[in-house]
C-alpha cells in the first residue's frame, strides 16, 4: 500500500512516570514523509485486509517501493515540578500516519501497535515521544505509558517495556527514517 498523503544512543532520558505532558500547539511544528525500517533494515509495511490495516515487518524485494509514513512533529512541555525521574523541559512528540485518516496507536492493554482511523484531535495513544539515537536511529516512546516503546517482536510491531535503569540500547526498539 503506497502512502496517499500529499504533502543512536538516545540524547537524553525517558519520559517521567505519571507525568502529564501538554502539547504546546495543536498544529505540528513540521511534518515529513519517510519510510520506516528496523535497525536490521527490515521494512515496516501496511496492508489493507478485511477493511482494516495490518502492520508488517518484512524483508522487501529489491525493486519494491517502500511504504511512506507521514510523521507530524509536535512540541510538548514538561513542567519541572512534575518530573519525577529527572526529565523536564521541551520534548518532541510525533504521530505516524501511513495513509489518510489512519494513525499508529498504542494499545497498552494488549501491548500492541495498531492502525486506527480517527479524527483530530487525535487521542493521546497516537502520540509518541521521539528519541534520537546514535547511528541516526530513532525510538518512539508511548506518551500514555512512559518507558514503553514501539518495538519489533515476532515480525510485528509491539509495545516493549524498557527498564529505566537500562541504556535503551536494545536494537528491537531502534528504527531508521529514510526520506528518499
Amino acid at each position: 500500500m503506497g502512502s496517499s498523503h500529499h504533502h543512536h544512543h538516545h540524547s537524553s532520558g525517558l519520559v517521567p512516570r505519571g507525568s502529564h505532558m501538554s502539547i504546546t500547539g495543536i498544529s505540528p511544528i513540521t511534518e515529513s514523509l519517510a519510510s520506516l525500517s528496523t535497525y536490521n533494515d527490515q521494512s515496516i509495511t501496511f496492508a489493507l485486509e478485511d477493511e482494516s490495516y495490518e502492520i508488517y515487518v518484512e524483508d522487501l524485494k529489491k525493486d519494491k517501493k517502500k511504504d511512506k509514513v507521514l510523521l507530524s512533529y509536535y512540541e510538548s512541555q514538561h513542567p519541572s515540578s512534575e518530573s519525577g525521574d529527572g526529565v523536564d523541559g521541551k520534548m518532541l512528540m510525533v504521530t505516524l500516519s501511513p495513509t489518510k485518516d489512519f494513525w499508529l496507536q498504542a494499545n497498552n492493554k494488549e501491548h500492541s501497535v495498531e492502525l486506527h482511523k480517527c479524527e483530530k484531535p487525535l487521542p493521546d495513544q497516537a502520540f509518541f515521544v521521539l528519541h534520537n539515537r546514535s547511528f541516526n536511529c530513532v525510538s518512539f516512546e508511548c506518551k500514555t505509558d512512559p518507558g514503553v516503546f514501539i518495538g519489533v517482536k515476532d515480525n510485528h510491531l509491539a509495545l516493549i517495556k524498557v527498564d529505566y535503569s537500562e541504556n535503551l540500547g536494545s536494537e528491537n526498539i531502534l528504527f531508521k527514517l529514510s526520506e528518499t
Epitope: S11, T30, Y73, V87, D88, G89, M91, L130, E141, E179
Partner: antibody
Framework: QVQLVQSGAEVKKPGASVKVSCKAS????????ISWVRQAPGQGLEWMGW????????HYVQKFQGRVSMTTDTSTSTAYMELRSLRSDDTAVYYC???????????????WGQGTLVTVSS | DIQMTQSPSSVSASVGDRVTITCRAS??????LAWYQQKPGKAPQLLIY???SLQSGVPSRFSGSGSGSDFTLTISSLQPEDFATYYC?????????FGGGTKVEIK
C-alpha cells in the same frame, strides 16, 4: 534562568591536553544533551560531538575520534570536554551548547556557554 | 555527511532593508534546520529551528522557510542590532554541520 558557565582561557603547548568545563544551572541537568562546538579565529562554527547528560552516551565527529573525550558530572551539573595531542590548528574558542529538546537533537542548540579560548602555541 | 553551503558570504545593507540569506544542503532532508546569529566576541544565539519556528524571545522580523535542500532566513526590516554573522545548521543527522556563515554589514 538557564545558564552555561565555562572555565577560563587556557594557553597550551603542542602535544599537551586541555580540559574545558561547562557548569549548567537553571534546569534539570540530566534532561538535556550537551554538544561542544568550536570556532577558530575568524572562522565558522564546527561541531565536535555530543554527550547525553542522562547516561553519558556520547558521539564524536570522526576527525576528533581518539583525541577528544566528553564527560558529565551530574552531581555538579557540569559537562567536560578534553582534547588531547593539541596542535596549533586547535587554537579556537570552544563552546558548550544545550540541545533544545530533551530527547532529540533535531531542534538545534537553545543555550550556549560564553566560550573558552584555547591557544596552542610553542 | 551533509554539507551546508550558505550564500552570500557577506551582504551590505541599510537599516530598514529586507535581507535574505540562503542555505543549501548537499542532500535533502525534511525541516530540521536551525539559524543562529553571532555577534563579535559572543556566543551564537538560536533564532529559528525546524526551518521556520521562531525561537522564544526572537523578534518577529526574523523568519525562516524551506525544506529539502534549500532553506532561507529573512530579516524583514533590518535593525541596527541585526548587524552580525548568521549561520545555518542541519540538525537532521549526525554529524551535525554548520554553513560557512553570512556576515551582514552596514552599507
Amino acid at each position: 534562568q538557564v545558564q552555561l558557565v565555562q572555565s577560563g582561557a587556557e594557553v597550551k603547548k603542542p602535544g599537551a591536553s586541555v580540559k574545558v568545563s561547562c557548569k549548567a544551572s537553571g534546569y534539570t541537568f540530566n534532561s538535556y544533551g550537551i554538544s561542544w562546538v568550536r570556532q577558530a579565529p575568524g572562522q565558522g562554527l564546527e561541531w565536535m560531538g555530543w554527550i547525553s547528560s542522562h547516561n553519558g552516551n556520547s558521539h564524536y565527529v570522526q576527525k576528533f575520534q581518539g583525541r577528544v573525550s566528553m564527560t558529565t558530572d551530574t552531581s555538579t551539573s557540569t559537562a567536560y570536554m578534553e582534547l588531547r595531542s593539541l596542535r596549533s590548528d586547535d587554537t579556537a574558542v570552544y563552546y558548550c551548547a544545550r540541545h533544545s529538546y530533551t530527547t532529540s537533537w533535531y531542534g538545534g542548540f537553545d543555550y550556549w556557554g560564553q566560550g573558552t579560548l584555547v591557544t596552542v602555541s610553542s | 555527511d551533509i554539507q551546508m553551503t550558505q550564500s552570500p558570504s557577506s551582504v551590505s545593507a541599510s537599516v530598514g532593508d529586507r535581507v535574505t540569506i540562503t542555505c543549501r544542503a548537499s542532500q535533502g532532508f525534511s525541516s530540521w534546520l536551525a539559524w543562529y546569529q553571532q555577534k563579535p566576541g559572543k556566543a551564537p544565539q538560536l533564532l529559528i529551528y525546524a526551518a521556520s519556528s521562531l525561537q522564544s524571545g526572537v523578534p518577529s522580523r526574523f523568519s525562516g522557510s524551506g525544506s529539502g535542500s534549500d532553506f532561507t532566513l529573512t530579516i524583514s526590516s533590518l535593525q541596527p542590532e541585526d548587524f552580525a554573522t548568521y549561520y545555518c545548521q542541519q540538525a537532521n543527522s549526525f554529524p551535525l554541520t554548520f554553513g560557512g556563515g553570512t556576515k551582514v554589514e552596514i552599507k
